[in-house]
């Protein structure tokens, strides 16, 4: 009978049928299993031996179906770099880290290695809204129209300007995109020193 | 026809260095793995190393690991063995052999061999 | 490493006999087994390929069995050019490992 036709099996183009399960072994010329995530190679496979896994050990994981002799040693979240844990290490995962927040990555090796402090945005403008929180530095947009922003910060979101009339008083002075609508009682006269704050 | 001419053998003192070369022709040798196998009266028939047929493969026994090494040149039809701290163990004769390069793995071709010995 | 036990190591026989050499090997090596005849200061010649399959050139008298561990070379009837020394090897797991060889002489 011709060789086996599950692993390990002949494979005369270097090339084996299940790329992710398997991997070419060029000693022996032979396709041969690859050990599952949470696992790494004990024995080496042969012609006549499969593959030999066994469990990563505590703190060490796999994350692939791989041939590696070894599992990764598992890494804290370094929180000098300003990294912090979402997800603890398991066998199969490394351990999840994302920047602290206020903070954005600034350094990339296909994870965040280092996270800095966002920039602040400045009265009248307010942080770019981002599809993921700390992937990059603030980009300052201003407000829009009928809202404003009095502070140097990070993370302060726009306001809409203060509706005089709903609270039963008229507008005193209008709001700006860096200050609130001053509101005035109807009947008093606004002095000049209380300009741009809101009269009760 | 295929050939394999194994040459470069000879007398060397322990410690010392060879290189064995092998010529070979009537394949296409680019498409074969080779190896070096040796025979002496006590051992009998051994392994000494593998090479795939890009080179890009080379493969040993712990006897001879870390001071043999095999090469090949494709565009030369050329296999060889740098042989480096040579000790008398390593007295042998030395055969270049191809590996069919199909599904059994057995060795088809043996050159007539090439005789190393290590003495002072 | 897998140990090949190739018996006889030597072997006295007569043209026309039928002659059979064994080699056990130290775990299943799964057919990964070739036979090899060899001639005074000549190179080992391949005869039989995973365990029972003919080599090109190679008479018919010749014929490898078995399976697992255990393995057998056969020469039906001996011709006075079959006397020589018969080595197995095993290429299913390296380091690729021979039998001690069986020299096979005129009775």
């Known amino acids: 009978s011709q060789p086996q036709a599950v692993p390990p099996y002949a494979s005369e183009n270097q090339t084996c049928r299940d790329q992710e399960k398997e991997y070419y072994e060029p000693q022996h010329r032979i396709c041969c299993s690859r050990c599952p995530p949470g696992t790494y190679v004990s024995a080496k496979c042969s012609r006549i031996r499969d593959t030999v896994c066994a469990t990563c050990a505590e703190n060490s994981y796999n994350e692939h179906w791989n041939y590696l002799t070894i599992c990764q040693l598992c890494r804290p979240c370094d929180p000098v770099m300003g990294l912090e844990e979402i997800a603890p290490c398991t066998s199969k995962r490394k351990t999840q880290c994302r920047c602290q927040p206020g903070m954005f990555c600034a350094a990339w090796a296909l994870e965040c290695t280092h996270c800095e402090l966002l920039s602040d945005c400045p009265p009248g403008t307010e942080a770019e809204l981002k599809d993921e929180v700390g992937k990059g530095n603030n980009h300052c947009v201003p407000c829009k129209a009928g809202h404003f922003q009095n502070t140097s910060s990070p993370s302060a979101r726009c306001q809409p300007h203060t509706r005089c009339e709903n609270q039963g008083l008229v507008e005193a002075a209008p709001g700006t995109a860096q200050s609130d609508t001053t509101c005035k009682n109807p009947l008093e006269p606004l002095p000049p020193e209380m300009s741009g704050t809101m009269l009760m | 026809e295929v050939q394999l001419v194994e040459s470069g053998g000879g007398l060397v003192k322990p410690g010392g260095s060879l290189r064995l070369s092998c010529a070979a022709s009537?394949?296409?040798?680019?498409?074969?793995?080779m190896y070096w196998f040796r025979q002496t009266p006590g051992k009998g028939l051994e392994w000494v190393a593998t090479?795939?047929?890009?080179?890009?493969?080379?493969y040993y026994p712990d006897s001879v690991k870390g001071r043999f090494t095999i090469s090949r040149d494709n565009a030369k039809n050329s296999l060889y063995l740098q042989m480096s701290s040579l000790r008398a163990e390593d007295t042998a004769m030395y055969y270049c052999?191809?590996?069919?390069?199909?599904?059994?793995?057995?060795?088809?071709?043996w050159g007539q061999g090439t005789t190393v010995t290590v003495s002072s | 490493d897998i140990k090949m036990t190739q018996s006889p190591s030597s072997l006295s026989a007569s043209v026309g006999d039928r002659v059979t050499i064994t080699c056990k090997a130290g775990?299943?090596?799964?057919?990964?087994l070739s036979w090899y005849q060899q001639k005074p200061w000549k190179a080992p010649k391949i005869l039989i390929y995973?365990?029972?399959r003919l080599a090109d050139g190679v008479p018919s008298r010749f014929s490898g069995s078995g399976s697992g561990q255990d393995y057998t070379l056969t020469i039906s009837s001996l011709q006075p050019e079959d006397f020589a020394t018969y080595y197995c090897?095993?290429?299913?797991?390296?380091?690729?490992?021979f039998g001690g060889g069986t020299k096979l002489e005129i009775k």
């Open positions: 052999v191809r590996e069919e390069n199909g599904n059994f793995y057995y060795f088809d071709y």
């Open positions: 009537g394949f296409t040798f680019s498409d074969y793995y």
């Open positions: 090479i795939s047929d890009g080179g890009s493969y080379t």
């Open positions: 775990q299943d090596i799964k057919s990964y």
């Open positions: 995973y365990a029972t």
């Open positions: 090897l095993q290429h299913g797991e390296s380091p690729w490992t």
